[in-house]
Amino acid sequence: LEVQVPEDPVVALVGTDATLRCSFSPEPGFSLAQLNLIWQLTDTKQLVHSFTEGRDQGSAYANRTALFLDLLAQGNASLRLQRVRVADEGSFTCFVSIRDFGSAAVSLQVAAPYSKPSMTLEPNKDLRPGDTVTITCSSYRGYPEAEVFWQDGQGAPLTGNVTTSQMANEQGLFDVHSVLRVVLGANGTYSCLVRNPVLQQDAHGSITITPQRSPTGAVEVQVPEDPVVALVGTDATLRCSFSPEPGFSLAQLNLIWQLTDTKQLVHSFTEGRDQGSAYANRTALFLDLLAQGNASLRLQRVRVADEGSFTCFVSIRDFGSAAVSLQVAAPYSKPSMTLEPNKDLRPGDTVTITCSSYRGYPEAEVFWQDGQGAPLTGNVTTSQMANEQGLFDVHSVLRVVLGANGTYSCLVRNPVLQQDAHGSVTITGQPMTFPPE
């Protein structure tokens, strides 16, 4: 006997009614007196509801189930589950027996939407740039466990220090509390998004913090306009300066370096003390120059992943900030050239010349030229693949018909360093082999 149930789980909101669909194809002349229908929990085999000997035997499941009795004769064996609870989640087996028997299992996925998050800020008064605050996002009575995301006002993810806890109440519904610990910038919006993964429902909460300003006006912070270019593996200085007033002491200074986009803390100096690197222990301040207004940051052993914008944030009586861009670069190796085929070559043969250059950054520009430096606009395919450090290996393939002889040059240009790496191959005489013997 073939029994049909939906393949996908039935999603039901807590407190609502759910229909677990199940059907069979009755033969002509079928009567309900011949039907044995049993619904049970798949795992424990606990009886949920049954219909035997032409009669509804009723619910064995907290009196919350019912059959569609007027539809049974047409093969509708579906079960109605009322006032769904979290504990109902799981697999239910629909077992149908007439002359023969068959069964199938349907999954019930329970869900409950999360409430609009409430946001709390601690401390919540007398806030200054450079202060560390704790923002708590609380959302209640959802199911299943939520996914929590923090974002800034532009929707960029905040990767500060986040601790999320989820606690089930006696009904099995979750209360979620997510705590973001963040260093305040000039001002900012902090948003919390609580996602129900089953309902694909997002509940949003946000808080905007505007720190206290001084009547005496902002601190002017200077950084270079152009990006700072640094070679992978070397050290880079992100320059930043301010003009200290007479009588200025380091005890009054809050200096924060953070990633502009994610607000991730990089390095800080507060209340007269270097708080150290929060960035893989690769940053340092010029402590002996701070009192003169030099707030520059030294970034050691530069990696491709460091590329981006860094904000230098200075707070004394008031605050100011400016962003400096770090452009990472790595020179490309001298190209190696390969020729295929490389034996018994004749004019008119089509050959493939491959130019390979390694471990550069950013992506290269590749040009092919003949011996006179004129561009070769043959069939060129260039691929660039980043390795685990983010450095690119470039492979450029020129497919060309051989003339009587010729030089084929490949130029791999690093667009940031304006550095060109050259490779060339010369094919002469015929018949010929490569490399020449």
Partner: antibody, heavy 116, light 107 residues
Framework: QVQLQQPGAELVRPGASVKLSCKAS????????MNWVKQRPDQGLEWIGR????????RYNQNFRDKARLTVDKSSSTAYMQLSSLTSEDSAVFYC?????????WGQGTTLTVSS | DIQMTQSPASLAASVGETVTITCRTS??????LAWYQQKPGKSPQLLIY???TLEDGVPSRFSGSGSGTHFSLKINSMQPEDTATYFC?????????FGGGTKLEIK
């Protein structure tokens, strides 16, 4: 509501040490610095130092650097101040107070009496 | 350390009278000054911060003013429950330092 609970009194001998406690409730303990303040009878207030319960970073008034040691127990939301080599000069009321620049909640204070 | 000088050390005022207490600092602290009230046998309570911001729940007869090195606390229309010692405190630098206190009594 926010509460900072401190024992009412401690009596200790000269030369001994004492560990004063301050149990916080009604707020996120790790979100606020905890300060300690000394007040001698009919005298002013002296800031001893403070601790960040989040990572136990401390700042001390130089006058108390060799006298006081601040610690926290995050699991019980309790801040502690250990005072060592006690003399009669250390007899005072010691308050805990939360905050960075403003101390918006204070404990009731522990009266420390150093006497033989 | 920043020195805090508070005056007067004590004063008595009649109910309904206006009272002014001043606080001077040894260096410019911008506006980072707070005022606290301490009643006999009790712990101090925050009245005003940032020189002029009234803490929640504090009666509006209290007000603060000043910036730089000169600050004052004013009580418009003294009430019996205002009998207390008042302290100023700078929050500009570490260590935090307090004024010596002004003991205010009812006449």
């Amino acid at each position: 509501q926010v509460q900072l609970q401190q024992p009412g009194a401690e009596l200790v001998r000269p030369g001994a040490s004492v560990k004063l406690s301050c149990k916080a409730s009604g707020y996120t303990f790790t979100a606020y610095w905890m300060n300690w303040v000394k007040q001698r009878p009919d005298q002013g207030l002296e800031w001893i130092g403070r601790i960040d319960p989040y990572d136990s970073e401390t700042r001390y008034n130089q006058n108390f650097r060799d006298k006081a040691r601040l610690t926290v127990d995050k699991s019980s939301s309790t801040a502690y101040m250990q005072l060592s080599s006690l003399t009669s000069e250390d007899s005072a009321v010691f308050y805990c107070a939360r905050g960075v620049r403003i101390f918006d909640y204070w404990g009731q204070g522990t009266t420390l009496t150093v006497s033989s | 350390d920043i020195q805090m000088t508070q005056s007067p050390a004590s004063l008595a005022a009649s109910v309904g009278e206006t009272v002014t207490i001043t606080c001077r600092t040894s260096e410019n602290i911008d506006y980072t000054l707070a005022w606290y009230q301490q009643k006999p046998g009790k712990s101090p309570q925050l009245l005003i911060y940032n020189a002029n911001t009234l803490e929640d729940g504090v009666p509006s007869r209290f007000s603060g003013s000043g910036s730089g090195t000169h600050f004052s606390l004013k009580i418009n229309s003294m009430q019996p429950e205002d009998t207390a010692t008042y302290f100023c405190k700078q929050a500009y630098d570490v260590p935090r330092t307090f004024g010596g206190g002004t003991k205010l009594e009812i006449k």
